[in-house]
Each structure stands twice: as structure tokens, then as C-alpha cells.
């Protein structure tokens, strides 16, 4: 099959602190050395970019400094945070990989991690 | 709104150069895969060339590699296809396309025309 | 390399009828990765279908995809005047990209 598959959580909770972590486990079909992990929200037909990280295999992911994301890899599989989180936010979050080098290309998308996010209530005034 | 024009086309005789370009607008330009699309005259359609986000990756057809660079300019939000050596059979509408973020190709320019002919 | 084979060729059909499009692919392609474009005489293609089954923003309802591994089909419920053009398909999970040959569907 000329298609790459990756797996993800169907369903994640936030933290009260606004912090959601998931797995995203590709099945690669060659030996990619470069490897650029998405990840993406999908609000009825739009999608936007969350964040994105490119990697050499065996090496950190480094996203963007003001980026609300951090990941860790371990072969075929990426371990991603998403930070800064608020109700508005819950959504279909989807894990995008790409084999990019060496040829051939490979896309793999995720069937998407739906990210419930519950902001905390704020805490009552004291009397003492 | 977003948008692709495509710029460069002419006629040219074989063995000869051209350069076409595609300027985008309307999007970040540097989050999107960009690719080049041909159609020979009365033809269907026919995947040219992709560069990927900071340029570093790219991929060509085989009826082009070695013949055709393509390339981009984040900075300009532009994107290029430089045409060496051309052949008859490279004639047709070049088209620029963007690849969305789940892959397929959701924007396209309107198309510019190269003709080989001696 | 897949190779994406469409049939028919030509489609002839009146306006209100319903319009079948296949395609076949060379060998299995993931359903995420599969793709239906529209061209009209003079103009670019234009996204329909992508991921096998989602339509393209501002694409009407009347136009559907469906399949999976390596047979693919677009439906068009009932046609409209618009609506006939060459349709293609395309598979985009792996490089290289490559289209069908295209069915063309003209006016009865």
C-alpha cells in the first residue's frame, strides 16, 4: 500500500492548566531520515496549522520559539504537547506526517485527537 | 483573497530557457508545499515539480529532472520554474498549485502557456 | 509510480441525471490521500473531493465521493448545466503525484 498510516488518540482532556499531551505513531514505509510532524485543527471544513517541527531522525524536535507546542521523539513515534489551552480551543487536533527525505515522499495524516478543554473555575474571595 | 498568478510563458525554441513564476498572496506562503502542474495542449494532467516549505526538499518528474529546478522565494511569496533544455513535448499550460495542509491540491493559479517551436 | 485509471472516458448525460465517475488505481492507496478535481474548458482545476469523501469549500452536496484501497468513485447526484467539465482524479499520499487520465462529461 502506497500510503503511510498514523495512529492517534481519538480522544484527550486537557489539564486544568490548559495542557494536552497525545501520542502520534506513524508506520513508516521507508527509511526516512527527515521527518516533519504537523499539527493541525479542524473546525467544521477549515483546517489551520497548530505548529510544526522538522527532525532528523534520532535528534529533538525543535518547533518554533513561539510556538504553543513541544515534542519528543522516539523512532516511529512523537510524543506532542500542546500548551496555553483554553475552552474555545477544544477541537479535532490532527497529527500530519511527512517522510521528507530521502525520496520518495511520504504523507500520512491522522484521523485527528478530539481535545476537550475545560477552563477552570476561577476561585471564590476568602472572608478571613 | 488567496490567490496564484503565474507569470513567464511565451514561445521558445527548442534547447532554449525560460523562467516562470508564480506569485501567491493571500496566505502564508512558507507553511504551504508548493507544485507545478503541466497540461500539453488537448492533454490531461501531468505532476511537474514540488518544493516543500523552506525549499530544501524537492521533487521532480522523470520526463523533467535534470532539465527542469524549481525554487522559491519565501521573502517575495514566489515561486519558480526554471526550464533548461527544452523539448517540443514540453509544450502546455503550467500551472502553480498549492498544497493544502491534508494534501490535496486546493489552490491553483490561472495557468501560463509555453510553446516549444522551432 | 501508481498508475490511476478512469472510466469511462466520456460520461453523456442530460441535465437532472445522475453522473458515476470511477477510478482505479494501480495498487492500494490510502483513503486520506485521494483526490477529484473539476477543469472547465479554459480554466484550472478546481478541488472537489479530497480525502476520498470531503468536499472541497463551496463545493455543493450534490457532488460525492466514496471508495477505498484501489477503486474510487465521484458521484454527481443531479447534474447541473455547470457541471459538465473533465473531472480527474489524483492520489497525493506518496510522490510521485500523479492524475487519471480524466472523464469528460458532456451534454447528452
Known amino acids: 500500500c502506497k500510503a503511510m498510516h498514523v495512529a492517534q488518540p481519538a480522544v484527550v482532556l486537557a489539564s486544568s492548566r490548559g495542557i494536552a499531551s497525545f501520542v502520534c505513531e506513524y508506520a513508516s514505509p521507508g527509511k526516512a531520515t527527515e521527518v516533519r510532524v504537523t499539527v493541525l485543527r479542524q473546525a467544521d471544513s477549515q483546517v489551520t496549522e497548530v505548529c510544526a517541527a522538522t527532525y532528523m531522525m534520532g535528534n529533538e524536535l525543535t518547533f518554533l520559539d513561539d510556538s504553543i507546542c513541544t515534542g519528543t521523539s522516539s523512532g516511529n513515534q512523537v510524543n506532542l504537547t500542546i500548551q496555553g489551552l483554553r475552552a474555545m480551543d477544544t477541537g479535532l487536533y490532527i497529527c500530519k506526517v511527512e517522510l521528507m527525505y530521502p525520496p520518495p515522499y511520504y504523507l500520512g495524516i491522522g484521523n485527528g485527537t478530539q481535545i476537550y478543554v475545560i477552563d477552570p473555575e476561577p476561585c471564590p474571595d476568602s472572608d478571613f | 483573497q488567496v490567490q496564484l498568478v503565474e507569470s513567464g510563458g511565451g514561445v521558445v525554441q527548442p534547447g532554449r530557457s525560460l523562467r516562470l513564476s508564480c506569485a501567491a498572496s493571500g496566505f502564508t506562503f512558507s507553511r504551504y508545499g508548493m507544485h507545478w502542474v503541466r497540461q500539453a495542449p488537448g492533454k490531461g494532467l501531468e505532476w511537474v515539480a514540488v518544493?516543500?516549505?523552506?525549499?530544501?526538499?524537492?521533487y521532480y518528474a522523470d520526463s523533467v529532472k535534470g532539465r527542469f529546478t524549481i525554487s522559491r522565494d519565501n521573502s517575495k511569496n514566489t515561486l519558480y520554474l526554471q526550464m533548461n533544455s527544452l523539448r517540443a513535448e514540453d509544450t502546455a499550460v503550467y500551472y502553480c498549485?498549492?498544497?493544502?495542509?491534508?494534501?490535496?491540491?486546493?489552490?491553483w493559479g490561472q495557468g501560463t502557456m509555453v510553446t516549444v517551436s522551432s | 509510480e501508481i498508475v490511476l485509471t478512469q472510466s469511462p472516458g466520456t460520461l453523456s448525460l442530460s441535465p437532472g441525471e445522475r453522473a458515476t465517475l470511477s477510478c482505479g488505481a494501480s495498487q492500494s492507496v490510502g483513503s486520506n490521500y485521494f483526490a477529484w478535481y473539476q477543469q472547465k474548458p479554459g480554466q484550472a482545476p478546481r478541488l472537489l473531493i479530497y480525502g476520498a469523501s470531503s468536499r472541497a469549500t463551496g463545493i455543493p452536496d450534490r457532488f460525492s465521493g466514496s471508495g477505498s484501497g484501489t477503486d474510487f468513485t465521484l458521484t454527481i447526484s443531479r447534474l447541473e448545466t455547470e457541471d459538465f467539465a473533465v473531472f480527474y482524479c489524483q492520489h497525493y499520499g506518496s510522490s510521485p503525484w500523479t492524475f487519471g487520465q480524466g472523464t469528460k462529461v458532456e451534454i447528452k
Open positions: 518544493i516543500w516549505y523552506d525549499g530544501s526538499n524537492k
Open positions: 498549485a498549492r498544497a493544502g495542509h491534508l494534501g490535496a491540491f486546493d489552490i
